[in-house]
Amino acid sequence: FGISGRHSITVTTVASAGNIGEDGILSCTFEPDIKLSDIVIQWLKEGVLGLVHEFKEGKDELSEQDEMFRGRTAVFADQVIVGNASLRLKNVQLTDAGTYKCYIITSKGKGNANLEYKTGAFSMPEVNV
């Protein structure tokens, strides 16, 4: 299942948390490529068979997306070229918590990184003056 004959590229993720019912961001950056059409971004979630999101050839490719994420994901398409593969997750659910993998393929090589995503009912602390 691996890609042969390609170098590794650096992929960096940041653990984050999402508020149930709101939109969340799963952060991922990578070594950019000069050609958008050479970049493939795949987001996966442990315990989920289908893809969370896929972006390739300059656009979203949602055909192999898992049912539980349909209509709820987006990447920042205009920022992919500069190495931003972060995922926007709409209407965060409790079941969205878990381990995600940001998997990147470019003309330079491939790489991936995991991130832990927590979900809950987080509120901003009240500050009394």
């Epitope: 979630k45 068979l49 393929i105």
Partner: antibody, heavy 116, light 113 residues
Framework: QVQLVQSGAEVKKPGSSVKVSCKAS????????IHWVRQAPGQGLEWMGG????????KYAQNFQGRVTITADESTSTAYMELSSLRSEDTAVYYC?????????WGQGTTVTVSS | DIVMTQSPDSLAVSLGERATINCKSS????????????LAWYQQKPGQPPKLLIY???TRGSGVPDRFSGSGSGTDFTLTISSLQAEDVATYFC?????????FGQGTKVEIK
Amino acid sequence: QVQLVQSGAEVKKPGSSVKVSCKASGDTFTTYQIHWVRQAPGQGLEWMGGIMPIFGTTKYAQNFQGRVTITADESTSTAYMELSSLRSEDTAVYYCARRNYGMDVWGQGTTVTVSS
Amino acid sequence: DIVMTQSPDSLAVSLGERATINCKSSQSLLYRPVNKNFLAWYQQKPGQPPKLLIYWASTRGSGVPDRFSGSGSGTDFTLTISSLQAEDVATYFCQQYYSTPITFGQGTKVEIK
């Protein structure tokens, strides 16, 4: 060109287990799902389950829940399907297939015969 | 689970004539955000694995002759062989991949009349 090559035919006794392998060759992503489908003699196609090799995430058909285990070894690009507590009605050809807009690449099939 | 029902179970057609196979799903296979039907058609010859003919209900697979075409949307789909050739004798299956469990139609056997 991706190819899926399966292990050879097996003859098993009722109550035993069988493990069938499916090796991927050629240039393919770790993020393609590999599915297992079986076909009893003269019958239709029955989906058993699938795996996402990069995470080892699996999903199984209700009919096989508890009896089937699908695994993958990324280092050898091989997926496995193990079926336990075999009975005569498990006699079938077992196929692995890559999911990509349907199932675009299939293994050649492995015949499993369950007989006492 | 989505139930797939094919008709007819078998079909005898003269060489050069049109063969039509129908497939009905128990729920819609159209995913509107991508405007695609998650339906595939396969051809299977004796002793061989299935071969992908059509995906997205109407897109021909790699190397599939243009006499094979798929149509339909939602719950009703059709596979058409415009001019039957001797090598088209096989069993044809529809399959939904809209959701798991993935399910197949029971198959339609195509023979020469």
